[in-house]
Structure formats: C-alpha cells, structure tokens
C-alpha cells in the first residue's frame, strides 16, 4: 500500500530536504524558511535566496516552513484553570499547564482543564498524582472510595456498590440495631 | 434515535432552587460528556456546565459556579442540574446536549432536548 499524499507533499518531496518545489515553476527548487519565519516571496531562480520575514508579535512558526503567514500564538484558557507555563516566541508557541498540586484531564485532543490532586484524607496515596493523572488513594478501614475520596461507610446505602468494602460495618451496624430489640 | 428529554423547569423566587433533570435514550449514555446549555430571552446560547463520563470532572461557567451543581446517574441514563441561589439573570430555557468534542476547541452539541424554561421573578 502506498501512502496517500497531499499535493503539497507530493510537490516537496520533488525537493531535497529543506526545499520546496516553486508552485509556478516546478524546475525549481526553493530553500525553505527558517522556524520563526514565514514565506513572503518564492525564490525568483535556481541558487537564489526566499524572502523570509520573520514573524510578527503573537504569532510563530515552530519549524522550517513554506507558509505564507505565521501561526497565531494560542492563548491559555483561564476558565479551564490553566496557567501560562511559558510565552509564545517567534519559533515556538505559548506553553500551557495547571498549578502545583494539580493535573490534567483532557475533554479533548488538545483542550485541557486543570483539577486539584485528590489528597487521600481517610486513606494514603497508591499511586502519586501525575501531570494527566489524579492521585490514586486506598483508603482505610471503615471508609470506601467515592469520585477519588475516602468516605464513612455510615454513608453507604445498601444498593451502592460499597456495600461489599464496608460488609463489616454493615453487618456491626445491623448486629447492634438487633441486640437492642427483646 | 437519540433522544433527550428536560424537565423540572417552572417558576421560582430569587434565591430559590430548582433540579433539572434530562433523561436519555437512543445511546449508550456511558460513553458520552453531558452538558447543559441555556438561552435567555433574546439571547444566545451559553454554555452553564458540562460533566464527564466518570461522573467526576466537571466544567461551570463562571456566572454558575459555587451555586450550580452538575450530575449524572449512568445507571439511570439521566443528566441533572442542581440550582441553588437562582437569580434574575439565570431566567432561560435550560437544553440538555450530548457532547461531541472537536480535537481543537471547546464541545459542540451534537444533540439537544427540547429544553425546560426556568423562571427567576419575584
């Protein structure tokens, strides 16, 4: 099986690495832009050199290109908790992340927002929390797991599935409530 | 064929609560972000609060956050919106939406119910 190929990559791949093919005149062979620069004008000859500008404020190019304008620098979504890990630069785009003690979870492929690592109270840490990862917790005797924390089993219904973790407690809770009848 | 049906809507006093509820079929639920979205009179839609399938990540908007609460029961294959402190500005019909994310930007909805009109006057 071939891989399928877009035109542009098709026209490129004419070029040795770092040079485009001449979208009027496919003899002729460019030198690609430098990242943090973006394609003004088309080398006008063989051997002769591209115009490349370099990109204005809030925008970049992170690696060689032909693009005939610079990509807009993201911004960090502030109502997803996000912080600004790093400023976009002229070759490299805005680095987003969340604060300390907290992690990632991804809604989608590249939106992220920030949650606080759970702390385990009632239970100790299984596993640390990791930057797209929550805490993962034991918890202690008398206490069941519920959306990452550690609560009382005199919280647990019987139809819950904590019914198995707290059985114990359960079973002392029903003993006590019987010894109390004549 | 997807389905989403809200209810619990009516008219309440400033400060006062309402339990939206929107129950779901058509669909495997469990695979799927829910969210609700409202519309004010003469308004656009806004997005209020959306909640992933785990049932523990949760988004608000900001003009809800700390008086609305947002909740699913996957083994009832219903969505609910807890609200509490309704103000005037919370006036809207409130759409259940099952999410379908793009890989770049917020959610779109790619199905919404028929929506129930909340009321906020004294």
């Known amino acids: 099986l071939v891989p399928h190929l877009g035109d542009r990559e098709k026209r490129d791949s004419v070029c040795p690495q770092g040079k485009y093919i001449h979208p009027q005149n496919n003899s002729i062979c460019c030198t690609k832009c430098h990242k943090g620069t973006y394609l003004y004008n088309d080398c006008p000859g063989p051997g002769q050199d591209t115009d490349c500008r370099e990109c204005e404020s809030g925008s970049f190019t992170a690696s060689e290109n032909h693009l005939r304008h610079c990509l807009s620098c993201s911004k960090c979504r502030k109502e997803m908790g996000q912080v600004e890990i790093s400023s976009c630069t002229v070759d490299r785009d805005t680095v987003c992340g969340c604060r300390k003690n907290q992690y990632r979870h991804y809604w989608s492929e590249n939106l992220f927002q920030c949650f606080n690592c759970s702390l385990c109270l009632n239970g100790t840490v299984h596993l640390s929390c990791q930057e797209k990862q929550n805490t993962v917790c034991t918890c202690h005797a008398g206490f069941f797991l519920r959306e990452n924390e550690c609560v009382s089993c005199s919280n647990c219904k019987k139809s819950l599935e904590c019914t198995k973790l707290c059985l114990p407690q359960i079973e002392n809770v029903k003993g006590t409530e019987d010894s109390g009848t004549t | 064929e997807v389905q989403l049906l809200e209810s619990g809507g009516g008219l309440v006093q400033p400060g006062g609560s309402l339990r939206l509820s929107c129950a779901a079929s058509?669909?495997?639920?469990?695979?799927?972000?829910m969210g609700w979205v409202r519309q004010a009179p003469g308004k656009g839609l806004e997005w209020v609060s959306w909640i992933a399938v785990d049932g523990i990540h949760t988004y608000y908007a900001d003009s809800v956050k700390g008086r609305f609460t947002i909740s699913r029961d996957n083994s009832k294959n219903t969505l609910y919106l807890q609200m509490n402190s309704l103000r005037a500005e919370d006036t809207a019909v409130y759409y259940c939406?099952?999410?379908?994310?793009?890989?770049?930007?917020?959610?779109?909805?790619?199905?919404w119910g028929q929506g129930t009109l909340v009321t906020v006057s004294s």
């Open positions: 058509g669909y495997t639920f469990t695979e799927y972000t």
């Open positions: 939406a099952k999410l379908d994310w793009t890989a770049t930007d917020f959610s779109i909805f790619d199905y």
